[in-house]
Interface confidence: low
C-alpha cells in the first residue's frame, strides 16, 4: 500500500511593519513541534502595502481599511483556511508614528484605533497594534539577525549554512536604517554600558547577553533629508537652494509648510520670506557629506565615548549586519559586496552624485523619480552616519555586512518581535526532545 503523506503540522504568524514611509506584511511559518528550536521559523511571504506609512492617514483614517486589504487578502490566500483562527497577527508601528505621537497623542491613537478595527475584521487571531519603542526596534532587529544566523544555537557546525556565518557563537551587531529613525545594537566587549537607557539584558537559550542599543529618532534617511534641507535653507539668500546632495540639473519645488511639518525640523525652523523654494542640484559628494555632518552634534559628550548628540556609544565590537535602508540603498548603488572597501564606496559615491540628472534618469528609467533623485543623498548619508556617527573606520568597514535576507527571511525587527510575543525564544537551552510550551517558565 502506498504511504499517504501526513498533513504538515505547521504554525503561522503575521507581523505588519508599519514604517514611516510604507507598511509591509510578513508571514512566518514553523513546524509546530519544533517551535523552541533555534532557526526553525522562516518567512514565507512579504507583501508591501501600496501607499505611504500609516501616519500619513491622519486626515483620512477611513481609508486605512482599504489600504490594508490587498496584503491581508494575500495572507488569507497563503495561510491555509484551517489555520486562520490560530494565526496571530501583530502590527508594530515605528518612528513615523512615534513622531506623530509627539505632535498629538490623540491623532496617533486615532490612527491606531482604526488600524486595529480594520485588522480585527479578518479571520486571524489579531493580537493588537502598537507603537514599538526605539529600544524594542533595535533589540528585535538584533534578535532577528542572530536567530537567522544560528548564533543562539549551542551546536557548533563544521559547515556554514549562511553566507556570513563564522563558526563561533559571537553575535552580530545590528544596524537598522529606516525613514524616520536608525538603530545601532550590539554586544560590547567587556565594556560597562554607561547609560542605563541603552542597556538591555537578555537570557536566551541558556546564555546571558548584555546588549547596547540606541535608536536615533529623526535620523532615518527621510527625516535626515528634511533636517538637512531645513538647516540649509536658513542660510539661502533667496528661494533657490543649491544642493550638493542632488544631481546636477535636478530641480524640485518644496513647500515650506511641508518642510516644517515634521517635529524633526523644529530646531531649524524660522520665518522665511517665501512659501516655497526650489532645490537645484549641483551634485558634489564632498560638500553633501560636509552638510550632513552638521546634523551630528559631536561637541559635547557626558560619557567616555559618544556617537553624536551626547548619546553614549561603546567601542564597536565584532561583525555587524546592516539592513533595511542600509541594504536597499547600497544594493541600488551596487555597493553591498564584501570586497568593496570604504575608500572604494566613497569613490563610487563621488562619481554617482556628479552624474547629471538627465543621464541618471536615462540609466535608471524604471525607477520612480522621487526615489531615484534621493540615492545620492541617501548613499552619502549612510557613509556619514557609519563613519562619523558610529565611528566605523576604513579598517572596521569590512566588518559591516549589508544584508537583505538571511535564509530567505528579511533582516529586520519583525521576526524578533514575533518570536518574543509567541514565546518562541526560551531563556534556557531546550532539551533535545521537543517539549511543550508549558515546559518553559
Amino acid at each position: 500500500t502506498q504511504n499517504k503523506a501526513l498533513p504538515e503540522n505547521v504554525k503561522y504568524g503575521i507581523v505588519l511593519d508599519a514604517g514611516s514611509s510604507h507598511t509591509s506584511l510578513y508571514i512566518y511559518k514553523w513546524p509546530a513541534e519544533k517551535e523552541n528550536d533555534t532557526g526553525v521559523v522562516h518567512q514565507v511571504e512579504e507583501c508591501r502595502v501600496k501607499g505611504p506609512g500609516i501616519s500619513k492617514f491622519v486626515q483620512k483614517v477611513n481609508e486605512i481599511g482599504i489600504y490594508l486589504t490587498d496584503c491581508m487578502e494575500r495572507a488569507r490566500e497563503v495561510i491555509p483556511r484551517s489555520q486562520h483562527q490560530e494565526t496571530p497577527v501583530y502590527l508594530g508601528a515605528t518612528a513615523g508614528m512615534r513622531l506623530l505621537r509627539m505632535e498629538s497623542e490623540e491623532l496617533a491613537d486615532r490612527v491606531l484605533d482604526v488600524v486595529e478595527r480594520s485588522l480585527s475584521n479578518y479571520p486571524f487571531d489579531f493580537q493588537g497594534a502598537r507603537i514599538i519603542t526605539g529600544q524594542e526596534e533595535g533589540a528585535y532587529g538584533w534578535i532577528t539577525i542572530n536567530y537567522l544566523l544560528g548564533k543562539f544555537s549551542q551546536k557548533t557546525r563544521w559547515f556554514s549554512i549562511v553566507p556570513y556565518e563564522t563558526n563561533n557563537q559571537e553575535t552580530f551587531g545590528a544596524l537598522d536604517l529606516g525613514g524616520a529613525s536608525t538603530q545601532v545594537t550590539f554586544v560590547p566587549q567587556n565594556q560597562t554600558i554607561e547609560s542605563p537607557d541603552n542597556a538591555l539584558q537578555f537570557r536566551l537559550y541558556g546564555k546571558d547577553y548584555n546588549v547596547y542599543t540606541h535608536s536615533f529618532l529623526c535620523y532615518g534617511k527621510d527625516q535626515a533629508l528634511w533636517q538637512k534641507l531645513a538647516k540649509d535653507i536658513q542660510v539661502a539668500s533667496n528661494e533657490i537652494l543649491r544642493d550638493p546632495c542632488f544631481h546636477p540639473g535636478y530641480k524640485k519645488v518644496v513647500n515650506v509648510s511641508d518642510l516644517y511639518k515634521t517635529p524633526c525640523t523644529k530646531r531649524f525652523e524660522m520665518t522665511l520670506p517665501f512659501q516655497q523654494f526650489e532645490i537645484q542640484g549641483i551634485g558634489n559628494y564632498q560638500q553633501c557629506h560636509q552638510s550632513i555632518l552638521e546634523l551630528f552634534n559631536t561637541s559635547y559628550c557626558p560619557y567616555s565615548q559618544c556617537a553624536f548628540n551626547g548619546i553614549f556609544l561603546p567601542p564597536l565590537q565584532g561583525d555587524f549586519g546592516a539592513f533595511s535602508a542600509f541594504y536597499f540603498v547600497m544594493k541600488f548603488l551596487n555597493l553591498t559586496s564584501e570586497k568593496v572597501s570604504q575608500e572604494k564606496v566613497t569613490e563610487m559615491m563621488k562619481k554617482f552624485c556628479a552624474q547629471p540628472w538627465e543621464e541618471i534618469k536615462t540609466s535608471y528609467a524604471g525607477v520612480k523619480e522621487k526615489y531615484l533623485s534621493e540615492y545620492c543623498f541617501s548613499g552619502t548619508y549612510i557613509l556619514s552616519l557609519l563613519l562619523q556617527g558610529y565611528h566605523f573606520t576604513a579598517d572596521s568597514w569590512e566588518h559591516i555586512h549589508f544584508i537583505g535576507k538571511i535564509q530567505g527571511s528579511d533582516a529586520g525587527w519583525t521576526l524578533g518581535y514575533m518570536l518574543n510575543l509567541t514565546n518562541m525564544i526560551p531563556a534556557e537551552q531546550p532539551l533535545s526532545t521537543p517539549l511543550s510550551h508549558s515546559t518553559y517558565v
Partner: antibody, heavy 119, light 107 residues
Framework: EVQLVESGGGLVKPGGSLKLSCAAS????????MHWVRQAPEKGLEWVAY????????YYVDTVKGRFTISRDNAKNTLFLQMTSLRSEDTAMYYC????????????WGQGTTLTVSS | DIQMTQSPSSLSASLGERVSLTCRAS??????LSWLQQKPDGTIKRLIY???TLDSGVPKRFSGSRSGSDYSLTISSLESEDFADYYC?????????FGGGTKLEIK
C-alpha cells in the same frame, strides 16, 4: 443549513437587566465573529455590538457602551448579550448575525427576539 | 462614524417595473457595502455584498453597482415577493452603519 435562533427577550422595567442568547448551528461557530443588531418599532436597523471568534476583539455602538456586554461560549455554540441599566429607547427587536471577513459580513441572520422596556 | 444616506425612503411600484435604490456614504468605503432585504415578518436576508456581488440563491433580477461614493441596488423586473424593506450596510469600518431603509410597496 445555517441557523441562528435568538431567545431571552421580554418585558423589563427601565433600569432593569436582561440577557439575550443566540444559539448557532449548521456552521463552525468558533470560526465566526458575531454581531447583535437591533430594530426599534417602525425604525431602521441599528448595529449594536460585535465579538470576534476568540472573544479578543469587542466593539459596541456608543449608546450601549458600559451598559451592554457581548460574550460567547464556543463550546456551546452560543452568543450572549447581557443588558443592564435598560432604557425605553432600548426597546427593539434584537437580531444576531454572523461575520467571517468581508465576503461573509452579516450574511446570515436570526429571526430576532423582542425586548420591551416599559414601566 | 460613517453615515449612510439611503433614498428614497419609500417607493411604490408595479409588478414588472424596474426600480433603483441608492445609498451614499459620507466617507470612502471602498466598495465594502451590502444590501439586505427585510420581509414583513421580520426575516432578514443578505442579497448583495462587496457592492455588486450577488449572494448565492438570490435571483438575477437583483444587481448592485457603484459610482464613486454612490451605491445602487436595482431590481430589473419586480415580482410580488420583492415587496419588502431594503437596507444598505457599510462594513469598511466600525461602527457598522446602515442606511435608513427603503420601503418598497405595491402600487
Amino acid at each position: 443549513e445555517v441557523q441562528l435562533v435568538e431567545s431571552g427577550g421580554g418585558l423589563v422595567k427601565p433600569g432593569g437587566s436582561l440577557k439575550l442568547s443566540c444559539a448557532a448551528s449548521g456552521f463552525t461557530f468558533s470560526d465566526y465573529g458575531m454581531h447583535w443588531v437591533r430594530q426599534a418599532p417602525e425604525k431602521g436597523l441599528e448595529w449594536v455590538a460585535y465579538i470576534s471568534s476568540g472573544s479578543s476583539v469587542i466593539y459596541y455602538v456608543d449608546t450601549v457602551k458600559g451598559r451592554f456586554t457581548i460574550s460567547r461560549d464556543n463550546a456551546k455554540n452560543t452568543l450572549f448579550l447581557q443588558m443592564t441599566s435598560l432604557r425605553s429607547e432600548d426597546t427593539a427587536m434584537y437580531y444576531c448575525a454572523r461575520d467571517l471577513y468581508y465576503d461573509h459580513v452579516l450574511d446570515s441572520w436570526g429571526q430576532g427576539t423582542t425586548l420591551t422596556v416599559s414601566s | 462614524d460613517i453615515q449612510m444616506t439611503q433614498s428614497p425612503s419609500s417607493l411604490s411600484a408595479s409588478l414588472g417595473e424596474r426600480v433603483s435604490l441608492t445609498c451614499r456614504a459620507s466617507q470612502e468605503i471602498g466598495g465594502y457595502l451590502s444590501w439586505l432585504q427585510q420581509k414583513p415578518d421580520g426575516t432578514i436576508k443578505r442579497l448583495i455584498y462587496a457592492a455588486s456581488t450577488l449572494d448565492s440563491g438570490v435571483p438575477k433580477r437583483f444587481s448592485g453597482s457603484r459610482s464613486g461614493s454612490d451605491y445602487s441596488l436595482t431590481i430589473s423586473s419586480l415580482e410580488s415577493e420583492d415587496f419588502a424593506d431594503y437596507y444598505c450596510l457599510q462594513y469598511a469600518s466600525y461602527p457598522r452603519t446602515f442606511g435608513g431603509g427603503t420601503k418598497l410597496e405595491i402600487k
